[in-house]
């Protein structure tokens, strides 16, 4: 049993490790980037394609804060959101409503991610809290699934081994406040 | 499914040290936080210290600092826990547990026993 | 170091009945709160966290409660499989502490 998505109160999505959620259906109070990309896979024929490298789909950035009970990121992270239906890549629009989407009529792509990296993030807290560690699992690019009749969601959330490592260098530790002096912290079971 | 395996019981002698091993699977480690917990027999838990995998962070309970040393090998996902200068009052269950923060314990290792005496 | 104070140390209940186990920390901390369900021979579960958030497949019979330095768990109707030892712990301030735990045993 892994990390749960946990949706908080600002309806963000927060992935959480272990678990990989779907998109969001829309993006509502997150300030999108409004950059598509397809995911480095070539255009090739539009309307013939048969292998799922043919086809693309659009990974818009976004940014959000993480919320932890009370706390909250001191900075917004930026992460992905697998978007729309896969087709063509050349037929995929270059930007959020300009063109039009290509609808298959044969075996249904999905636009799912791909590969996830883990980012540790500082929380702080109301009432002198002092910050806490915490670390989310972020989407780090998406890609078309042909989907059956025999696909489940399950198998729609592939493990991002190969995510992307943060960066090396050491990051400033979370120092523990004294019994005066609180610092912390604290999050989710069973 | 999220898992953590822990190395066999070990009996020592006062003033050696243990190496406590845990094999994480399910994730990688490096995407966690790694915590050992102890608990005497019939005791109540104690917090020995927290690292982060990915960059070598560490936290240790001061009561424990320059005893023990927290440490992961990435590439096995598995994460070691050494003790030195044992004594008695050391002997324990030690668990490995992990999770996405640093101030609370997801999922725990079934635990190593370790056993102080001369 | 925070003294978590759990109370009672021990209880006896009955399959059904509604069980409340407290814990007092010795100042502040917060809603930083955990507690955790342990078996005999067997390694810690966590239940709640941030005092009253269940976590992932705990059932909806357990919950959490309280801010500062009082918290408590309440089961409202006790299950078989719930016979264990319970304790609170503290993530507000390192080291983190843990209650000395409370055995919820069979009438």
């Known amino acids: 049993q892994g990390w749960q998505a946990f949706k908080n109160d600002a309806t963000e999505i927060i992935p959480e490790l272990g678990e990989y959620p779907e998109p969001p259906p829309e993006l509502e109070n997150n300030k999108t980037m409004n950059r598509a990309e397809n995911g480095g896979r070539p255009p090739h024929h539009p309307f013939e394609t048969k292998d799922v490298s043919e086809y693309s789909c659009r990974e818009l950035h976004f940014t959000r804060y993480v919320t932890d009970g009370p706390c909250r990121s001191a900075k917004p992270v930026t992460e992905l959101v697998c978007s729309g239906q896969c087709g063509p890549a050349r037929l995929l629009p270059n930007a959020i409503g300009r063109g039009k989407w290509w609808r298959p009529s044969g075996p249904d792509f999905r636009c799912i991610p791909d590969r996830y990296r883990a980012q540790r993030v500082q929380l702080l807290c109301p009432g002198g809290e002092a910050p806490r560690a915490r670390k989310v699992r972020l989407v780090a690019s998406c890609k078309c699934k042909r989907l059956t009749r025999f696909h489940n969601q399950s198998e729609l959330k592939d493990f991002g081994t190969e995510a992307a490592r943060p960066q090396k260098g050491r990051k400033p530790r979370p120092r523990a406040r004294s019994a005066k002096a609180n610092q912390a912290e604290l999050e989710n079971a069973y | 499914q999220v898992q953590l395996v822990q190395s066999g019981a070990e009996v020592k002698k006062p003033g050696a040290s243990v190496k406590v091993s845990c094999k994480v699977s399910g994730f990688p480690i490096k995407d966690t936080f790694q915590h050992w917990v102890r608990q005497a027999p019939g005791k109540g838990l104690e917090w020995m210290g927290w690292s982060d995998p990915e960059i070598g962070d560490t936290e240790y309970a001061s009561k424990f600092q320059g005893r023990v040393t927290m440490t992961e090998d990435t590439s096995t996902d598995t994460a070691y826990m050494e003790l030195s200068s044992l004594r008695s009052e050391d002997t324990a269950v030690y668990y490995c547990?992990?999770?996405?923060?640093?101030?609370?314990?997801?999922?725990w290792g079934q635990g190593t026993t370790v056993t102080v005496s001369s | 170091d925070i003294q978590m104070t759990q109370s009672p140390s021990s209880l006896s209940a009955s399959v059904g009945d509604r069980v409340t186990i407290t814990c007092k920390a010795s100042?502040?901390?917060?809603?930083?709160v955990a507690w955790y369900q342990q078996k005999p021979g067997k390694a810690p579960k966590l239940l709640i966290y941030?005092?009253?958030t269940r976590w992932t497949g705990v059932p909806s019979r357990f919950s959490g409660s309280g801010s500062g330095t009082d918290f408590t768990l309440t089961i409202s109707s006790l299950q078989p499989e719930d016979f264990a030892t319970y304790y609170c712990q503290q993530g507000d301030t390192l080291p983190y502490t843990f209650g000395g735990g409370t055995k919820v045993e069979i009438k």
């Open positions: 547990a992990t999770g996405d923060t640093t101030y609370k314990f997801d999922f």
């Open positions: 100042q502040d901390v917060h809603t930083a």
């Open positions: 941030w005092a009253s």
